[in-house]
Interface confidence: low
């Protein structure tokens, strides 16, 4: 990923001082990935190169909300996905019992203070078992192929970060709107495993992007907004970022 960051830098991604209000961080993702039907996959994003604090991470599949990891309230999985989505590891998301319909774009949306919102994109392709097995036989680690893949991934990261809206993170209307739009008709948030509401666990004392809404809603008010959905906590989520 160092090469990724170098490429991003080389292509002139804005790296302004924090006090200017400009967004300085970058999102690293697992890029384009494939998995076998019926199997599982881990979606991972990583925010780096910023001293902003993370308040919430949303995982979305195209126009559907999959999960939220909130600093104060912990993990929350959309009822539509609770049987097949597991929180973690870290701020990642594990998709289980994959179907071909799971093929598509997935987005990790980092709400941070004071930078604003960072969005990472992952494209998942779910392959039929035979195709996956066939593909595995031909995964020869050719340097050229790896380099090409790296360029594709980095370009995707560059585009995603560059096009991320300047809008600030965790606006109330934004969160409320997302949940109403993407969870319309859902009676409640059902936890995949019962656990008490947990505040974010500080996973790493790194100077960049740390756990914390240094911009978002407070616990009480998030409950106010999410009570429509009987918002329940799945437990702790760990916010951490490294400088890149």
């Amino acid at each position: 990923m160092r090469w990724c960051l170098l490429l991003i830098w080389a292509q002139g991604l804005r790296q302004a001082p924090l006090a200017s209000g400009m967004m300085t961080g970058t999102i690293e993702t697992t890029g384009n990935i494939s998995a076998e039907k019926g199997g599982s996959i881990i979606l991972q994003c990583h925010l780096s190169s910023t001293t902003a604090q993370v308040t919430q991470v949303n995982w979305e599949q195209q126009d559907q909300l999959l999960a939220i990891c909130n600093a104060d309230l912990g993990w929350h999985i959309s009822p539509s996905f609770k049987d097949r989505v597991a929180p973690g590891p870290g701020l990642g998301l594990t998709l289980q019992s994959l179907t071909v319909n799971d093929t598509g774009e997935y987005f990790c949306i980092y709400h941070t203070y004071p930078d604003g919102t960072y969005t990472g994109r992952i494209f998942l392709e779910v392959l039929e078992s035979s195709v996956a097995e066939h593909g595995a036989r031909f995964q020869i680690p050719l340097l050229g192929a790896m380099a090409a893949t790296l360029v594709v991934i980095c370009t995707a990261v560059i585009v995603v970060v560059a096009l991320t809206r300047k809008k600030k993170a965790l606006r109330i209307h934004s969160v409320e709107g997302d949940l109403r739009r993407k969870s319309a008709g859902q009676e409640e948030w059902s936890p995949s495993a019962p656990s008490p509401p947990g505040s974010c666990v500080q996973a790493e004392a790194a100077p960049a992007g740390l756990c914390g809404e240094q911009r978002g809603e407070d616990c009480a008010e998030l409950h106010d907004y999410f009570n429509v959905l009987s918002y329940r906590s799945l437990g702790n989520c760990s916010f951490f970022t490294e400088t890149g």
């Epitope: 604090q53 004071p114 209307h173 505040s199 740390l210 240094q214 911009r215 616990c219």
Partner: antibody, heavy 115, light 107 residues
Amino acid sequence: QIQLVQSGPELKKPGETVKISCKASGYTFTNYGMNWVKQAPGKGLKWMGWINTYTGEPTYADDFKGRFAFSLETSASTAYLQINNLKNEDTATYFCARYEYFDYWGQGTTLTVSS
Amino acid sequence: ETTVTQSPASLSVATGEKVTIRCITSTDIDDDMNWYQQKPGEPPKLLISEGNTLRPGVPSRFSSSGYGTDFVFTIENTLSEDVADYYCLQSDNMPYTFGGGTKLEIK
């Protein structure tokens, strides 16, 4: 419930130092940045800067660089504003306010600087 | 730095009347404007946050609109309890800047 409780009023002489505290309760202190706002008597509000309550890294507005210092005592969920070499124009009420929306505020600490 | 120009500086209305306060910013701030009410001897209270979003528990007679550089805060059917100073705050970029304030009085 969420509360920010600030230290009491201060009367200081020019050249002295003051340290104002802001104790947070009802939420995870290190999850939310703390802003500081100045309000001179009969005047409007002025943002002084904020401190990242996880890393302790402060950011100061231009008018508050030099004599002003934000600090933390994380174990006590407390943020501090220290003003050195006090001047008459520092006479004001100082507020701590949680994160960018400034949705929760301390009650304010009135600082009077007079010789 | 984004400067915020708030007007009027003061106004006096009869109860039941409509109040309109305007804030104009020197740069485009999308909809990153917040509105506060401050009563004497109290800290400011957030009424409306970014995106013209009314905060929980705030009466619906308060509203706001605007995007870019021009923002309007409205109180419909003003009550005597609305007597206070009102401030706008742009939270689009640092340093965050407040408007100069509007003192609302009841005739």
